[in-house]
């Protein structure tokens, strides 16, 4: 799975959209997750609407926002006020009981706001 | 396993550039940050800066002025660039990867400044 | 920049002891503190990520906590290859910082 990097600058938000099969994933909630090392777990940081047919509410953790189209086949995650330390490894996840696919490998990078200089 | 090793050489003189490169095998450098901490002998660490996949840049302010940092991803290697060394600038060098926290590091390889 | 102070700057301890390390920010870190271990000639090590994620490998007796900027690192026995210099370091903010360490060293 190739990893998909976008840049965000510090202060300002960043839209990540991860596309799926609408079909496949039929039912299935989704999450946003941190990979802190590769044989670690990843780290949920939040999930779609516990009622699936509610996925299309914002459902927010912190500066974090996510929010699924379910019929277009497409999970947004947005970060809101960047920080330096959001910098890093994150997954989109299609979630099936207590298995999780990977929907998405995103590295996020977070740039100086050159105003700040 | 990631393993990184610092390289470049341990002597430089006051004035000069510092060069030091790093070369990571057993992974991509691709899909991670990388970043340069150091420390003087019996002291504590300090970061230098970090370069990110795409090439950008973040420099510990103590430092901006001189540094510079690039990522070669065919070579699996990126570097260090310091000018107008002085003494103050006599420390192990660690390459380590940045990812969330620094979760590999090079052995570290000593520079040293001094005519 | 984030000010991390570590204290006690020396811990003389025996083998089979508690240590408790402790590490205060000077501003909000939000979590993202990190402990290492470094010892003698080598290259620091990661323990703990996000002020209490055991880094993979990393032995159950190591633990992290926090309470608001206060941070501390736990080592419930020591064992002889524990005596070592620790560090925390944030990554919340620009430049990332270290704190200046704690040596546990053997009573």
């Known amino acids: 799975l190739n990893t998909t990097v976008l840049q965000g600058m510090a202060g300002q938000s960043l839209r990540v959209s991860c596309t799926y099969d609408a079909l496949k994933h039929w039912g299935r909630r989704k999450a946003w997750c941190r990979q802190l090392g590769e044989e670690g777990p990843c780290q949920r940081v939040v999930s779609t609407h516990g009622v699936w047919l509610l996925a299309f509410l914002k459902k927010r953790n912190g500066s974090t926002v996510i929010a699924d189209d379910t019929l277009a086949g497409t999970v947004t995650i947005t970060l809101k006020n960047l920080q330096a330390g959001d910098a890093g490894l994150y997954q989109c996840q299609s979630l099936r009981g207590r298995e999780a696919e990977v929907l998405q490998k995103v590295l996020v990078e977070v740039l100086e706001d050159p105003l700040d200089d | 396993q990631v393993q990184l090793q610092e390289s470049g050489p341990g002597l430089v003189k006051p004035s000069e550039t510092l060069s030091l490169t790093c070369t990571v095998s057993g992974g991509s450098i691709s899909s991670y940050y990388w970043s340069w901490i150091r420390q003087p002998a019996g002291k504590g660490l300090e970061w230098i800066g970090l370069i990110y996949t795409s090439g950008s840049t973040i420099y510990n302010p103590s430092v901006k002025r001189r540094v510079t940092m690039s990522v070669d991803t065919s070579k699996n290697q990126f570097s260090l660039k310091l000018t107008s060394v002085t003494a103050a600038d006599t420390a192990v060098y660690y390459c380590?990867?940045?990812?969330?926290?620094?979760?590999?590091w090079g052995q570290g390889t000593l520079v040293t400044v001094s005519s | 920049e984030i000010v991390l102070t570590q204290s006690p700057a020396t811990l003389s301890l025996s083998p089979g002891e508690r240590a408790t390390l402790s590490c205060r920010a000077s501003q909000s870190v939000s979590s993202y503190l990190a402990w290492y271990q470094q010892r003698p000639g080598q290259a620091p090590r990661l323990l703990i990520s996000?002020?209490?994620n055991r880094a993979t490998g990393i032995p159950a007796r190591f633990s992290g906590s926090e309470s608001g900027t206060d941070f501390t690192l736990t080592i419930s026995s020591l064992e002889p290859e524990d005596f070592a210099v620790y560090y925390c370091?944030?990554?919340?903010?620009?430049?990332?910082?270290f704190g200046q360490g704690t040596k546990v060293e053997i009573k």
């Open positions: 996000d002020a209490s």
């Open positions: 380590a990867r940045d990812l969330f926290y620094f979760d590999y």
């Open positions: 370091q944030q990554r919340s903010n620009w430049p990332w910082t």
